[in-house]
């Protein structure tokens, strides 16, 4: 999906009042300082291509955070502010559902949420220059 | 202050159809997403569908139901259910908000899917 006509503003809006809110509540018990923040994005359409990524991607040592409530959120603004976004996602939760019997939190999938947070951290400061 | 009223809601058989109807009035400039949540007995709140310029529906749902609003006014939101399955009996919600919609409520409407 290409998400150069996505209301950004309108997604930073939703991060900040609620998404935010779900992924500090994941994160919880863990020090800020935990994780080194190795993924980057480079302007507003490439980050939310990470975050999509790193949300709804299965990674090694971290199966599923698409059952996440930050996750089922992300995907709602995603889909909101972004038009055509929802026509674009496969049936990839009922999948997942079937895959995963618990939830298991893991120190890779806290790892992958750290550096989540370091994409919208990033994708809400559009203008500044990558380091 | 904003205030969300559903209707529609009703007693339906397998495979027939409802249209909710969800009328905003008040401070209707911050409603700029609004959304269609269901609740059914002993079960999580889940957002069923939502629309700002573009849409989203939940993976159970997808196909079947239908949302929109009133462009014109920006003051109504519909939600077509087609193909019901008794799974969807539930209280339906209507709910806004600036960029997520989950800052406004309405009271709910009752949907009963059932032979």
């Known amino acids: 999906y290409d998400f150069t006509n996505c209301d950004f503003e309108k997604i930073k809006a939703a991060y900040l009042s609620t998404i935010s809110k779900d992924l500090i509540t994941y994160m919880s018990g863990t020090k800020s300082t935990e994780f080194n923040n190795t993924v980057s994005c480079s302007n507003r359409p490439h980050c939310l291509t990470e975050i999509q990524s790193l949300t709804f991607n299965p990674t090694a040592g971290c199966a599923s955070l698409a059952k996440e409530m930050f996750a089922m959120k992300t995907k709602a603004a995603l889909a909101i502010w972004c038009p055509g976004y929802s026509e674009t996602q496969i049936n990839a939760t009922q999948a997942m559902k079937k895959r995963r019997k618990r939830k298991v939190t893991t120190n890779k999938c806290l790892e992958q949420v750290s550096q989540l947070q370091g994409l919208w951290r990033r994708f809400n400061r559009p203008l500044l220059k990558q380091q | 202050q904003l205030q969300l009223v559903e209707s529609g809601g009703g007693l339906v058989q397998p495979g027939g159809s409802l249209r909710l109807s969800c009328a905003a009035s008040?401070?209707?400039?911050?409603?700029?997403?609004m959304g269609w949540y269901r609740q059914a007995p002993g079960k999580e709140r889940e957002l069923v569908a939502a629309?700002?310029?573009?849409?989203?529906y939940a993976d159970s749902v997808k196909g079947r139901f239908t949302i929109s609003r009133d462009n014109a006014k920006k003051n109504t939101l519909y939600l077509q259910m087609d193909s019901l399955k008794p799974e969807d009996t539930a209280i339906y919600y209507c709910?806004?908000?600036?960029?997520?919609?989950?800052?406004?409520w309405g009271q709910g409407t009752q949907v009963t899917v059932s032979a």
């Open positions: 709910a806004s908000g600036d960029s997520y919609p989950d800052e406004y």
């Open positions: 008040g401070s209707i400039f911050s409603i700029d997403a």
């Open positions: 629309i700002g310029s573009g849409t989203y």
